[in-house]
């Protein structure tokens, strides 16, 4: 089990590092987006795992951004985010495979309404229970 957890961490960290770099290979990214969305978590250790991903980064002082799958919809009344988060999530759930371009990548400020827990604990718990 420890080996499995290590392998999972390595895969996730690699997925985060390479997020958005290859529009033809988005299966791992979309799977991880789905995990974050479902487990209500962000990043592996912490949301800050995402801050090195250049494609998500804002300019200057607004650098810290995370994927929209980290957005905590229940913590906000902001309906505009529904179009950006919920609909893409639903299309992925329906396996509507399509190549994604960097312009399609949805990011939100990490200081807003996001999940502040990393996903490691939730996934480890899930592994222990299965």
């Amino acid at each position: 089990r420890a080996q499995l957890e290590r392998s999972l961490r390595d895969v996730v960290e690699k997925t985060i590092q390479k997020y958005g770099t290859n529009p033809e290979e988005t299966a791992a990214e979309e799977s991880w987006d789905y995990v974050q969305f479902q487990l209500r978590c962000c990043g592996w250790h912490y949301p800050q795992d995402w801050f090195q991903v250049l494609i998500l980064r804002g300019n200057g002082s607004e650098a810290h951004r995370v994927p929209c799958s980290c957005y905590n919809l229940s913590a906000t009344n902001d309906s505009t985010i529904l179009d950006k988060v919920i609909l893409p999530q639903l299309s992925r759930l329906g396996h509507l495979a399509r190549s994604r371009h960097s312009a399609d990548i949805c990011a939100v400020p990490a200081e807003s309404h996001i999940y502040r827990e990393g996903c490691a604990q939730g996934l480890q718990k899930w592994l222990h229970n299965n």
């Epitope: 912490y46 800050q48 795992d49 801050f51 090195q52 980064r57 002082s61 650098a63 810290h64 905590n72 913590a75 906000t76 400020p109 990490a110 200081e111 807003s112 309404h113 996001i114 502040r116």
Partner: antibody, heavy 115, light 107 residues
Framework: QVQVKESGPGLVAPSQSLSITCTVS????????VSWVRQPPGKGLEWLGV???????NYHSALKSRLSIKKDHSKSQVFLKLNSLQTDDTATYYC?????????WGQGTLVTVSA | DIQMTQSPASLSVSVGETVTITCRAS??????LAWYQQKQGKSPQLLVN???NLADGVPSRFSGSGSGTQYSLKINSLQSEDFGTYYC?????????FGGGTKLEIK
């Protein structure tokens, strides 16, 4: 443009509580974090805590038991409360826009803890 | 909590010189690091975040580098307005800390 301004009591007696208000403009408290930092006279910076856009907080682990940060969106204000003050809590207290890196700082308010 | 160790504590340099200030974290902070400049009697100002990303309006003579536990701030061709105290700050985990500061004085 972004503005951040602290207002505090100046002098507080030992064992009493400190309350400081940070009034902000030029950005929304729903999408930005606001942090608190203090600096004792002639010393370095000490991070105290942050309140995020969703109202959740992170606190300095050694101060967690006597520190609280809250906010009022309608007034664009963030509040710091520090209980059971001692003389070593004497410092300039700053609030700043930003939860991770702190992009805009207030001018600070000097708080002296003395009988 | 993660400790941040800055060095040197102070240095005396001339205008036009290049200086490097370093910051060591007690554990891997994965580039979640900011640098600030503070002048006497003033509030700190953000220079760099995410270890290498220059904040808005910061001159290009400033640059940040590093990864893991070791980070540095380099100032090329020092100007008179660059003198003051510099602080690093990490934001990995759930509680942040500042380094002890580096006082940059005019020679």
């Amino acid at each position: 443009q972004v503005q951040v301004k602290e207002s505090g009591p100046g002098l507080v007696a030992p064992s009493q509580s400190l309350s400081i208000t940070c009034t902000v403009s030029g950005f929304s408290l729903t999408t930005s974090g606001v942090s608190w930092v203090r600096q004792p006279p002639g010393k370095g910076l000490e991070w105290l805590g942050v309140i995020w856009g969703d109202g959740s907080t992170n606190y300095h682990s050694a101060l967690k038991s006597r520190l609280s940060i809250k906010k009022d969106h309608s007034k664009s204000q963030v509040f710091l409360k520090l209980n059971s003050l001692q003389t070593d809590d004497t410092a300039t207290y700053y609030c700043a826009k930003g939860g991770y890196s702190l992009a805009h700082w207030g001018q600070g308010t000097l708080v002296t803890v003395s009988a | 909590d993660i400790q941040m160790t800055q060095s040197p504590a102070s240095l005396s340099v001339s205008v036009g010189e290049t200086v490097t200030i370093t910051c060591r974290a007690s554990e891997n902070i994965r580039s979640n690091l900011a640098w600030y400049q503070q002048k006497q009697g003033k509030s700190p100002q953000l220079l760099v975040n995410v270890a290498t990303n220059l904040a808005d309006g910061v001159p290009s003579r400033f640059s940040g580098s590093g990864s893991g536990t070791q980070y540095s701030l380099k100032i090329n061709s020092l100007q008179s307005e660059d003198f003051g105290t510099y602080y690093c700050q990490h934001y990995w985990g759930t509680t942040w800390t500042f380094g002890g500061g580096t006082k940059l004085e005019i020679k």
